[in-house]
């Protein structure tokens, strides 16, 4: 899975007469050129990272240290792109006093490149600075990605604190953090779940309303109507259910679902879906109940190849 190709940001419509605006335009054009070059460099480097990761899988003992090396190389490389992106975004938004609180805000300010952004802290909303991945392309864009599974390099069998704060690599596999997701869903929000199986088929599920309650309410999940092509709604069973982790059992079960399903999730008793389950590779992907499952599509024993969960405001207009 390559990282998304980066597009030139759309230019805002401004009077041509204004020198200041012309200067800004020139800055953006320049930054866009730099971005394109870095994007090309990134794709080449990504191939070498993938090769390293594949190598890692067959070298048991050296896996951890080599993985760290590969990840830090990739991170370093992407940091350059992040700086360029953020400068581009700031160039476009400096003149506006509107708060940037999610990816849809950035989209509305004409930032149209999918990738990593650092959302500024907001004292009024009580939200800290947050690094997010924005999907500016899917179905009009403006999506803040809250979860991704694609490489299997990050364990999702984590404790309450880690699920609260978030973990993983923002460009790879990650959980944004329940506290952040809760804050982002305080306004009316949509949820989109995208899935890919091991045959390369892609499906999605979308929910007209998505709320994650606060920690006091155990990050309970509330969902609106389902639409999509991922078969039967496999999140309905988890609706109005508290979040559980291996060290905090909030499920409706005599068994500890988080321990049985090896993840943190809105476990009922136990699953119709388990998007934070164990990442199983091809060959092992259809043998386990604790995988990344979506019952409505491939059943209870099929672990998916890729999953992404993303949110945006209900009233978002591309």
């Amino acid at each position: 899975q390559k990282p998304p190709k980066r597009k030139t940001p759309a230019q805002p419509k401004v009077p041509a007469c204004c020198e200041e605006v012309q200067e800004l335009k020139a800055q953006v054009a320049n930054l866009s050129r730099v971005l394109s070059e870095l994007g090309r460099k990134q794709e080449k480097d990504w191939v070498s990272v993938v090769m390293q990761v594949m190598e890692l899988e067959s070298s048991g003992k050296r896996m951890e240290s080599r993985l760290t090396e590969a990840e830090s190389k990739y991170s370093e490389m992407n940091n350059q792109i992040d700086i360029m992106q953020l400068q581009a975004a700031q160039t476009l938004t400096q003149t506006s006093a509107d708060a940037i609180y999610d990816c849809s805000s950035l989209y509305q300010k004409n930032y149209r490149i999918s990738g990593v952004y650092r959302l500024p802290s907001n004292d009024f909303l009580g939200s800290p600075e947050l690094e997010v991945f924005c999907d500016m392309e899917t179905k009009g864009g403006g999506w803040t990605v809250i979860q991704r599974r694609k490489s299997g390099l990050v364990s999702f069998y984590r404790d309450w604190k880690q699920y609260k704060q978030g973990f993983g690599s923002i460009r790879g596999d990650f959980w944004l953090g329940n506290e952040h997701i809760h804050r982002l869903s305080r306004q009316p929000t949509r949820l989109r779940v995208e899935m890919e199986d091991w045959e390369g088929t892609v499906r999605y599920a979308e929910y007209s309303h998505f709320v994650l309650s606060n920690e006091l309410n155990s990050y309970r999940l509330f969902l609106g109507n389902y639409s999509g092509n991922a078969g039967n709604d496999a999140l309905y069973y988890h609706n109005n259910t508290a979040f559980s982790t291996k060290d905090k059992d909030n499920d409706n079960c005599l068994d500890k679902c988080a321990q049985l399903r090896k993840g943190g999730y809105w476990y009922n008793c136990c699953t119709d879906s388990n998007l934070n389950g164990v990442y199983y590779r091809l060959g092992e992907h259809d043998k386990h109940l604790d995988g990344i499952t979506w019952y409505g599509w491939h059943g209870a024993n099929y672990s998916l190849k890729r999953v992404e969960m993303k949110i945006r405001p209900e009233d978002f207009k591309p």
């Epitope: 005599l254 068994d255 136990c270 119709d272 209870a300």
Partner: antibody, heavy 125, light 107 residues
């Protein structure tokens, strides 16, 4: 043969305490969740409490929460119900039951497949 | 808490009759329903679990159906030993709850 035998019932004054025991045999006790159900004279069944096989998860009916404690000793194949601050309305026959688990499509279904004969608890002054 | 409501509360029937007892949950419980039979002075006995699965050793004249909120226990041909009280019970979420019972007696 799977068997459950309750004991420890009797007459107790309001505010008093009692500990019920349930001795299990004929199955691997530690592998199964267990439950207590009661039946007041002339009334229907009321679920009281349940405990997982390891003893790590416990659940209670609102009517007994904070007063009753379910526990188990897997080395002795015994289930317990410690009843404190007893009230007249706790008067009932108390049954212990083995909880069986079935799994369909990733969901666990629980049901009480074997029951003891019951022990009578009377709370009266 | 999920409320379970059985109907009728009692039914008079003859040997050979088909008897149907219904149980309604106050909210959806998928198929998390069990049916028990209890005779006077005896412990309850499991008949049906997961709404429609027949417990081992239970005669095939007993059957269960339903999903969500509405469930049915059917005795296709009533036998003398079937005169008893029947309870439905949900295990969808804690606290587990029983219906108030349906007494089947001789007409």
């Amino acid at each position: 043969e799977v068997q459950l035998v309750e004991s420890g019932g009797g007459l107790v004054q309001p505010g008093g305490s009692l500990r019920l025991s349930c001795a299990a045999s004929g199955f691997t006790f530690s592998s199964y969740a267990m439950s207590w159900v009661r039946q007041a004279p002339g009334k229907g069944l009321e679920w009281v409490s349940a405990i997982s096989g390891s003893g790590g998860s416990t659940y209670y009916a609102d009517s007994v929460k904070g007063r009753f404690t379910i526990s188990r000793d897997n080395s002795k194949n015994t289930l317990y119900l410690q009843m404190n601050s007893l009230r007249a309305e706790d008067t009932a026959v108390y049954y212990c039951a083995k909880v069986e688990r079935d799994m369909v499509r990733g969901h666990y279904y629980y049901y009480m497949d074997v029951w003891g004969k019951g022990t009578t608890v009377t709370v009266s002054s | 808490d999920i409320q379970m409501t059985q109907s009728p509360s009692s039914v008079s029937a003859s040997v050979g009759d088909r008897v149907t007892i219904t149980c309604r949950a106050s909210q959806g419980i998928s198929s998390w329903l069990a049916w028990y039979q209890q005779k006077p002075g005896k412990a309850p006995k499991l008949l049906i679990y997961a709404a429609s699965s027949l417990q081992s050793g239970v005669p095939s004249r007993f059957s269960g159906s339903g999903s969500g909120t509405d469930f049915t226990l059917t005795i296709s041909s009533l036998q003398p030993e079937d005169f008893a009280t029947y309870y439905c019970q949900q295990a969808n979420s804690f606290p587990w709850t029983f219906g108030q019972g349906t007494k089947v007696d001789i007409k």
